[in-house]
């Protein structure tokens, strides 16, 4: 627009106006007249680029006329009043309403004054994110899925994670004409380390004040990963009882623990208590390989530990889990 003081009447309007599919929107358009300038407006006209004729006209003496009277309305222009506000309301926005519109004032004696406004027809998408529960495959698979449904224009989906991963994004037409559903898969080689970790799907769209963040808690199903703790290689005759623990990570949770030895069943000094194995005091040296076998829905895995109880004064040594 020309700077103030140029002595010219100018039309003020935003260059772009957003409106939502199915809703109504107002295309604002005003005539700005410098203080000392005299002007008389005889007609307001709205036209769409590329179409012949006017879609809406407000004449100083005849009032309004519309190409689609049920969908258009001058919001402020009134017969018998100064025509300074040409703002036009459009009802029931359709995809095909998107485009460039010209708002024109016929002023006397200054002549035509017009401005172009781009109407953007938007549809606010609905966003969801869900985990894709996977097993250990050894190759990249979708582990999370983020869907932005019925957006116009299509939403932008990005993933944020410390785990790496690759996005795979696709688009299909939405339920409503002119809208788009965007689906983004987050792809990674599954591992037990990833299970329970979070990834974030970030959805950006013109209709959002700020991006929407959707967190997905990853699920990887894997058989138990087993280790035995509680032994420090310093067990001696005469010590109090000690405890070994069978540490198992798995998804789903372990369904059973089974203790044994390489020779078969447990010796009398070893008592199984679920994930724990109680080692009672012994009076002679031993050298036994213990086995903990853990089962879950995906299978069984085991860990082995060779335990030695050696001769030597117990006061000089520390043993783990002595009571």
């Amino acid at each position: 627009w020309p700077p103030p003081g140029t002595g010219d009447v100018v039309v003020q309007a935003p260059t772009q106006v957003p409106g939502f599919l199915g809703d109504s929107v107002t295309l604002p358009c005003y005539l700005q007249v410098p203080n000392m300038e005299v002007t008389h407006v005889s007609q307001l006209t709205w036209a769409r680029h590329g179409e012949s004729g006017s879609m809406a006209v407000f004449h100083q003496t005849q009032g309004p006329s519309y190409s689609e009277s049920k969908r258009l309305e001058f919001v402020a222009a009134r017969l018998g009043a100064e025509l300074r506000n040409a703002s036009l309301r459009m009802f029931g926005l359709r995809v095909e309403d998107e485009g460039n519109y010209t708002c024109l004032f016929v002023t006397f004696p200054q002549g035509s004054r017009s401005v172009d406004i781009w109407l953007r027809v938007l549809a606010k998408p609905q966003n969801t994110a869900e985990v894709q529960k996977v097993q250990l495959t050894g190759e990249p698979v979708p582990m999370a899925r983020c869907v932005s449904t019925g957006g116009r224009p299509p939403a932008q989906i990005t993933w944020h994670s410390d785990l790496g991963g690759m996005p795979n994004t696709s688009q299909v037409p939405g339920f409503l004409s002119g809208t788009v559903t965007v689906t983004s898969l987050w792809i990674l080689v599954p591992s037990s380390q990833v299970d329970g970790k979070n990834v974030t799907c970030k959805v950006e769209h013109e209709s959002f004040e700020k991006p929407q963040l959707l967190t997905v808690n990853l699920t990887v199903y894997y058989p138990p990963e087993v280790s035995i703790s509680g032994y420090d290689n310093n067990w001696y005759l005469g010590q109090n009882e000690a405890t070994l623990t069978c540490d198992a990570r798995s998804n789903p949770e372990p369904t059973g623990y089974n203790w044994s030895t390489t020779m078969g069943p447990l010796p009398p000094f070893a008592v199984a208590q679920g994930a724990q194995l109680l080692i009672r005091p012994v009076d002679k040296p031993i050298n036994t390989t213990l086995i903990c076998n853990v089962t879950n829905a995906l299978g069984a895995r085991q860990a082995e530990l060779t335990v030695q109880v050696k001769e030597g004064p117990p006061s000089e040594h520390s043993g783990i889990s002595r009571n």
Partner: antibody, heavy 121, light 109 residues
Framework: QVQLVQSGAEVKKPGASVKVSCKAS????????ISWVRQAPGQGLEWIAW????????NYNQKFTGRVTMTTDTSTSTAYMELRSLRSDDTAVYYC??????????????WGQGTTVTVSS | QAVVTQEPSLTVSPGGTVTLTCRSS?????????ANWVQQKPGQAFRGLIG???NRAPGVPARFSGSLLGDKAALTLSGAQPEDEAEYYC?????????FGGGTKLTVL
């Protein structure tokens, strides 16, 4: 075709009033702007005022404010200019002019034949 | 009070080109002054030629063109014809009124 036909010559005494008419034909009168312009003997043109025929909205040259009134009668497609408190320097030929519109701007399109007003005691 | 000044008289040969100018006492003429040009031939009614600085009125020959020339409004006649001999007036808009120039008597000789 578009035509503006003005009333005949007038002779008036100082202090009197004169009302000049301008009958339009050949176009939609109510959508038009009409200016009144005068030309004193041996002088250039002087713009007096304009009127929008459809509503009667006016804009006067401040020099004439209070002495001049412009009106229209849409039933007869006639514009009127009344000038009061006449002085000898109001002696001039008075013209009505319809403004035409080209799609971008206005211009002084069609003029009446002029009405001579003589102010003399 | 704005004063609009035109050349009192100009002469052009038939087929020649002549430029009539319109100067404003308030400074440079701009598009906001909506320069109008009006022609009056002897014994005939006035006729509008140009509006809005450079918009030729319907029916006006293309040899007439309006423009801004430096700080003045200008009417250029290219390829003058004998019938173009007339008085030419410019009018400038000053926010709330039109002011006419004194006119230019153009002779085609």
């Amino acid at each position: 075709q578009v035509q503006l036909v003005q009333s005949g010559a007038e002779v008036k005494k100082p202090g009197a009033s004169v009302k000049v008419s301008c009958k339009a034909s050949g176009y939609t009168f109510t959508s038009s702007y009409i200016s009144w312009v005068r030309q004193a003997p041996g002088q250039g043109l002087e713009w007096i005022a304009w009127i929008y025929a459809g509503t009667g909205d006016t804009n006067y040259n401040q020099k004439f404010t209070g002495r001049v009134t412009m009106t229209t009668d849409t039933s007869t497609s006639t514009a009127y200019m009344e000038l009061r408190s006449l002085r000898s320097d109001d002696t001039a030929v008075y013209y009505c002019a319809r403004h035409g519109y080209t799609g971008r701007g206005w211009y002084f399109a069609v003029w009446g034949q002029g009405t001579t007003v003589t102010v003399s005691s | 009070q704005a004063v609009v000044t035109q050349e009192p008289s100009l002469t052009v040969s038939p087929g020649g080109t002549v430029t009539l100018t319109c100067r404003s006492s308030t400074g440079a003429v701009t598009t906001s002054n909506l320069a109008n040009w009006v022609q009056q031939k002897p014994g005939q009614a006035f006729r509008g030629l140009i509006g809005h600085t450079n918009n030729r009125a319907p029916g006006v020959p293309a040899r007439f063109s309006g423009s801004l020339l430096g700080d003045k409004a200008a009417l250029t006649l290219s390829g003058a014809q004998p019938e173009d001999e007339a008085e030419y007036y410019c009018a400038l808009w000053y926010s709330n009124k039109f002011v006419f120039g004194g006119g230019t008597k153009l002779t085609v000789l």
